[in-house]
């Protein structure tokens, strides 16, 4: 049977804005991912800034409703925003417990949804896990 | 097919601890919360925890906070739980779980001087 | 915690008999995703407990079509159609909405 859906849960230092209300904090410790136990969507969420080559997790967490892109299995990120020259902000949704944990790939910021061979890369088969 | 196979039972001293295994076949380990449950004798059922294997991320019943460890061994995708401290109180049967689908067959603890 | 109060305590029947098993909360188990997180378990004599329902009304596989879940909010039944000799043992409710989970405290079907 399903669980309430469980994802990790980390907002950078001086990110505007909070989605820690959008569930309830597991009490993990402090060597876990932290983990966050959805109240309104069945969906996690995932933002990762890429500047130079180099991706920086953002925020991660619960959605606040179940939209399109949540069926999905995995953390596929598109480019969404360029918050500053030369930076671009990564976002993906995905309905499976912690899959907003790592991404297996970015796709190239100058074409959306697109995959490509810029970024950082997992080698097959590996996904680059965040390091909370 | 999916199958959960739990440690034999065990007869152990009070205030002794006592831990059991529950090794997981026929599916991808790491995908499924792993649950455990205690029954006492002749009484209904009772949540104590559950553990993600792919992070070790778990979530207790606030009343088994302190008595129950949870743990995994990916490698040979088993789940553990330690009791520690028994009392008479803690005799009982232990199931674990696949996120509450499939069951192992119980692990019967007997808590006795 | 949740409460999860389940009638009759026990239920003698006659093979072939419809039985039904009420499951009453003491809170709502809709969760805020839309999702009841309701199940119900059969345990037979000497056995592990084994999931025959979840989400209220959805049967687990190998489940037969005669074992009928329902309900919303706080009020939950499971329908026997037509009872037969391995349906015999104890009922439980189970919820996983709130925390911690909880079950009832089980309605065991015998026969008269």
């Known amino acids: 049977p399903p669980n309430r859906r469980t994802c990790v849960f980390f907002e950078a230092p001086g990110v505007r804005g909070s989605t820690k209300t959008l569930g309830e904090l597991l009490d993990t410790g402090t060597e876990l991912p932290r983990a966050i136990r959805c109240l309104y969507s069945r969906c996690c969420f995932g933002i990762w800034n890429l500047t130079q080559d180099r991706a920086q997790v953002e925020m991660q967490g619960c959605r606040d409703s179940d939209e399109p892109g949540c069926e999905s299995l995995h953390c596929d990120p598109s480019p969404r925003a360029h918050p500053s020259p030369g930076s671009t902000l990564f976002t993906c949704s995905c309905g499976t417990d912690f899959c907003n944990a790592n991404y297996s790939h970015l796709p190239p910021p100058g074409s959306p949804g697109t995959p490509g061979s810029q970024g950082p890369q997992a080698a097959p088969g590996e996904s680059i896990w965040m390091a909370l | 097919q999916v199958k959960l196979l739990q440690s034999g039972a065990a007869l152990v001293k009070p205030g002794a601890s006592v831990k059991m295994s529950c090794k997981a076949s026929?599916?991808?380990?790491?995908?499924?919360?792993v649950s455990w449950v205690k029954q006492s004798h002749g009484k209904s059922l009772e949540w104590i925890g559950e553990?993600?294997?792919?992070?070790?991320?778990?979530n207790f019943n606030e009343k088994f906070k302190g008595k129950a460890t949870l743990t995994v061994d990916k490698s040979t995708s088993t789940a553990y739980m330690e009791l520690r401290r028994l009392t008479s109180e803690d005799s009982a049967i232990f199931y674990c779980?696949?996120?509450?689908?499939?069951w192992g067959q119980g692990v019967m603890v007997t808590v006795s001087s | 915690d949740v409460v999860l109060t389940q009638t009759p305590g026990s239920l003698s029947v006659t093979l072939g008999d419809q039985a039904s098993i009420s499951c009453r909360s003491s809170?709502?188990?809709?969760?805020?995703?839309?999702?009841?997180?309701l199940e119900w378990y059969l345990q037979k004599p000497g056995q592990s407990p084994q999931l025959l329902i979840y989400?209220?009304?959805n049967r687990f596989s190998g489940v037969p079509d005669r074992f009928i879940g329902s309900g919303s909010g706080t009020d939950f039944t499971l329908k026997i159609s037509r009872v037969e000799p391995e349906d015999l043992g104890v009922y439980y409710c189970f919820q996983a909405t709130h925390d911690p989970n909880t079950f009832g405290a089980g309605t065991k079907l015998e026969l008269k």
């Open positions: 779980t696949r996120q509450r689908d499939y």
């Open positions: 553990i993600y294997p792919k992070n070790g991320v778990s």
């Open positions: 989400g209220v009304s």
């Open positions: 026929g599916y991808t380990f790491t995908d499924y919360w």
């Open positions: 809170q709502s188990l809709e969760y805020g995703d839309g999702y009841t997180y």
